[in-house]
Interface confidence: medium
């Protein structure tokens, strides 16, 4: 049943579910592909081309932002497939729990690298000396395992109920969430919206306060400080966090409207929308996971164009690749210019001058 | 537990009508799609209409512009009024209660659930002169 005609006392409603983009849609989504896999590979790159003690501890956050990214890039394909084919999934269950695992994991992941990165510059600017020892790298690794690991167990719950099948009877097999295993007929919809809602709180709500709270304190700090502050040093270090802000402004705009629509869709079931508005809702969805998606090729982009350091790693990187193909030997100060840490105030003043500080202190 | 309770079932007349009611309980009805099919004597259910959680509706090629199918959420029912009745709709006509896929899954009616159990007892309906 392809169509559904919606009858309101007063209006109709023409229902097409899931109305199809198109090529539109897939097309961005193999746009977002191919640069997510090249400029997501490029920063790991260059992150771990890097010597071990010139990377800071915002690194391990950067590096894990870009696995996060290209895990999930790598599915888009699957996605541009079902979304050209009408939502028609012919790659079998297995590829539809995994490549649906992976959106989650993404998700998780991504938010809460960005938390580390806002709470590890919260550290460096608010409160630098008593939180030195947070800032080291065997705390960024404990964070970053432990971050990985909640992600990989919050979207569990996709990996075991998502499936495959024909829902409504047509040829179309529809990759979807299946709570048939854990839910009876009454309850599946209030699993659907209590997975929904609890993913949007702590995919994107939870950390994206957390945030924000960050960049209080950060501002005020800033303030506050301003004229006290060596220029050099505050340089620097606003450098780094004008980066990291471009990074969570720009991931709450992609990921806004998905958890927007997605929550007043879920509301439809207790307030009763009109026919008319879940249609629109229903219709602009996929239009809103897809800005969303393209929130995993941006960082990369928004790294070259707010930070010329990094300009700088790709083009040692990219002058690297021509004088090798020209045959030509390389000194190792020009091996280590095509990092992402030296060149991106990886170790800043204010974290050299801390861990003294540090130190001194003990 | 579900509970459809179909009514309205009867004897009529070729070329007349009949409004079937089908009162709902044990689910969050608005986030349901409901439907109606009908078995005729030695032959397999069949679908008539069904309407989607948002009042979206969809109707077998055999009943277009005969048959309306609508609900309301407030009571919990949905209707299927039939007009210009005909001998081939003589059947058993059962209501079915299917939930709807969340938004991320395409917003489907669950209809491959239909042989999950959310049936009623089935209203005959008879059309003969």
């Known amino acids: 049943f392809d169509n559904y005609y919606g009858a309101d006392n007063q209006s109709e409603c023409e229902y097409t579910d899931w109305k199809s983009s198109g090529a539109l849609i897939p097309a961005i989504y193999m746009l977002v592909f191919l640069l997510g896999t090249t400029g997501n590979g490029l920063v790991l790159w260059t992150v771990f081309r890097s010597s071990r003690e010139k990377r800071r501890s915002a690194d391990i956050f950067i590096a894990s932002l870009a696995v996060a990214d290209l895990t999930f890039v790598v599915t888009l394909p699957l996605w541009a497939t079902y979304t050209y084919r009408d939502y028609d999934w012919p790659f079998g269950t297995f590829a539809c729990k995994l490549s649906s695992y992976l959106i989650f994991v993404n998700m998780y992941a991504s938010a809460f690298c960005l938390t580390g990165l806002s709470f590890d510059r919260y550290l460096a600017i608010v409160r630098p000396v008593a939180n030195a020892r947070l800032r080291l790298r065997v705390s960024g690794a404990v964070a970053t395992a432990v971050l990985w690991v909640l992600a990989a167990l919050l979207a569990m719950p996709v990996m075991v109920l998502r499936t495959t099948g024909d829902l409504e009877n047509t040829t179309k097999v529809q990759c979807y969430m299946d709570y048939s295993m854990v839910a009876t007929v009454s309850s599946e919809w209030a699993w659907e919206v209590g997975l929904g809602v609890s993913s949007t709180t702590v995919g994107f709500v939870v950390p994206f306060t957390i945030m924000l709270t960050c960049y209080f304190f950060i501002a005020q700090t800033i303030a506050g400080h301003f004229r006290k502050e060596r220029i050099e040093g505050l340089r620097k270090r606003r450098r780094l966090l004008s980066i990291i802000v471009v990074l969570v402004v720009t991931f709450a705009l992609c990921k806004m409207p998905y958890h927007l629509v997605k929550t007043l869709y879920m509301l439809g079931s207790l307030l009763h929308w009109p026919c008319d508005f879940d249609l629109f809702l229903m219709n602009i969805f996929p239009y809103c996971t897809c800005i969303s998606y393209v929130n995993s090729c941006l960082n990369p982009f928004l790294y070259a164009f707010f930070d010329p350091r990094f300009r700088q790693a790709c083009t040692s990187m990219l002058l690297m690749g021509q004088s090798r193909c020209a045959g030509t030997s390389h000194s190792s100060s020009g091996e280590k210019s095509a990092s992402y840490s030296s060149g991106h105030d990886y170790k800043d003043d204010d974290d050299k001058h801390h861990h003294h500080h540090h130190h001194h202190h003990h | 537990e579900v509970q459809l309770v179909e009514s309205g079932g009867g004897l009529v007349q070729p070329g007349g009508s009949l409004r079937l009611s089908c009162a709902a309980s044990?689910?969050?009805?608005?986030?349901?799609?409901m439907g109606w099919y009908r078995q005729a004597p030695g032959k397999g259910r069949e679908f008539v209409a069904a309407?989607?959680?948002?009042?979206?509706?969809s109707y077998a090629d055999s009943v277009k512009g005969r048959f309306t199918i609508s609900r309301d959420n407030s009571k919990n029912t949905v209707y299927l009024q039939m007009n210009s009745l005909r001998a081939e709709d003589t059947a058993v006509y059962y209501c079915?209660?299917?939930?709807?896929?969340?938004?991320?899954?395409?917003?489907?009616?669950?209809?491959?659930?239909?042989?999950?159990?959310?049936w009623g007892q089935g209203t005959q309906v008879t059309v003969s002169s």
């Open positions: 079915a209660a299917v939930p709807r896929a969340g938004i991320e899954s395409g917003a489907y009616c669950k209809w491959s659930y239909k042989d999950s159990g959310s």
């Open positions: 309407i989607s959680g948002s009042r979206g509706y």
């Open positions: 044990g689910l969050t009805f608005s986030s349901h799609c």
